[in-house]
């Protein structure tokens, strides 16, 4: 009998938004207020997430899906499903244990969130710095000086007048 029952589990008929109520002879009961089940065949409903404090509700909880939170102005989400809210900083800064601090020389942050990242090393790509970096902006890389020799440009082909092995001064 148990084997037959497991093959025809009455709980498998309970749709999302309900749970299989053992206290009521495995009848499908609606999820109580402030709870949900996002899949069928559940034996319990999960408690809805509550967006409190610095969290605010982006999507209300329903009987079939959890609430979704985001952060109040001046804060931003971290992690999956906005697990945490973290204080914004200004561009050119990052949040440290002691609050918002300016990016160190050689690093930048162009957003109000995240960390200061190193400026791009143009020379790794055989390029040179076209525009210097700041705390708020990455460097802009451009052709290396060798590529900008007289008679050469990014549009016209290089003039054929140069001797092999001769580098511009």
């Amino acid at each position: 009998f148990e084997r037959t029952r497991s093959l025809q589990d009455p709980c498998s008929n309970c749709p999302a938004g309900t749970f299989c109520d053992n206290n009521r002879n495995q009848i499908c009961s609606p999820c109580p207020p402030n709870s949900f089940s996002s899949a069928g065949g559940q034996r319990t409903c999960d408690i809805c997430r509550q967006c409190k404090g610095v969290f605010r509700t982006r999507k209300e909880c329903s009987s079939t899906s959890n609430a979704e939170c985001d952060c109040t102005p001046g804060f931003h989400c971290l992690g999956a499903g906005c697990s945490m809210c973290e204080q914004d900083c200004k561009q050119g800064q990052e949040l440290t244990k002691k609050g918002c601090k300016d990016c160190c020389f050689g690093t930048f942050n162009d957003q109000k969130r995240g960390i200061c990242r190193p400026w791009t090393n143009c020379s790794l790509d055989g390029k040179s710095v076209l525009v210097n970096g700041t705390k708020e902006r990455d460097v802009v890389c451009g052709p290396s000086p060798a590529d900008l020799s007289p008679g050469a440009s990014s549009v016209t082909p290089p003039a054929p007048a140069r001797e092999p092995g001769h580098s511009p001064q």
Epitope: H76, C77, G79, A80, E94, T96, K97, R113, G114, I115
Partner: nanobody, 115 residues
Framework: QVQLVESGGGLVQAGGSLRLSCAAS??????MFWYRQPQGKQREYVAH???????NYADSVTGRFTISRGNNDNTMYLQMDNLKPQDTAVYYC???????????WGQGTQVTVSS
């Protein structure tokens, strides 16, 4: 490409300890997280650590779990002490990129605490 690899899970008796590790590669990460998912339940936040050492814990693990980051910045640990049967779950390492706009995930490591 980004890779997060967890290790250190296993079977332990209640009151015991485990140390989980997460090795991340392929990007700069601003924040690294531990999440866990007990069987048949929702995934839940455990703890996180930022690149400059700020930490935070879920109430259920505060005082028992300690999160830390290795010297190379892309390794993270979770020291779990005084483990309880309700800590049984698959533990996932996750990491936000430098701009906190994308979260990457590891494959998970099973932690089972027997009573």
């Amino acid at each position: 490409q980004v890779q997060l690899v967890e290790s250190g899970g296993g079977l332990v008796q209640a009151g015991g300890s485990l140390r989980l590790s997460c090795a991340a590669s392929g990007d700069i990460f601003s924040i690294m997280f531990w999440y866990r998912q007990p069987q048949g339940k929702q995934r839940e936040y455990v703890a996180h650590i930022t690149s400059n050492g700020r930490t935070n814990y879920a109430d259920s693990v505060t005082g028992r779990f300690t999160i830390s980051r290795g010297n190379n910045d892309n390794t993270m640990y979770l020291q779990m002490d005084n483990l309880k049967p309700q800590d049984t779950a698959v533990y996932y390492c996750a990491a936000d990129d430098a701009t906190n706009t994308r979260t990457y995930w590891g494959q998970g490591t099973q932690v089972t605490v027997s009573s």
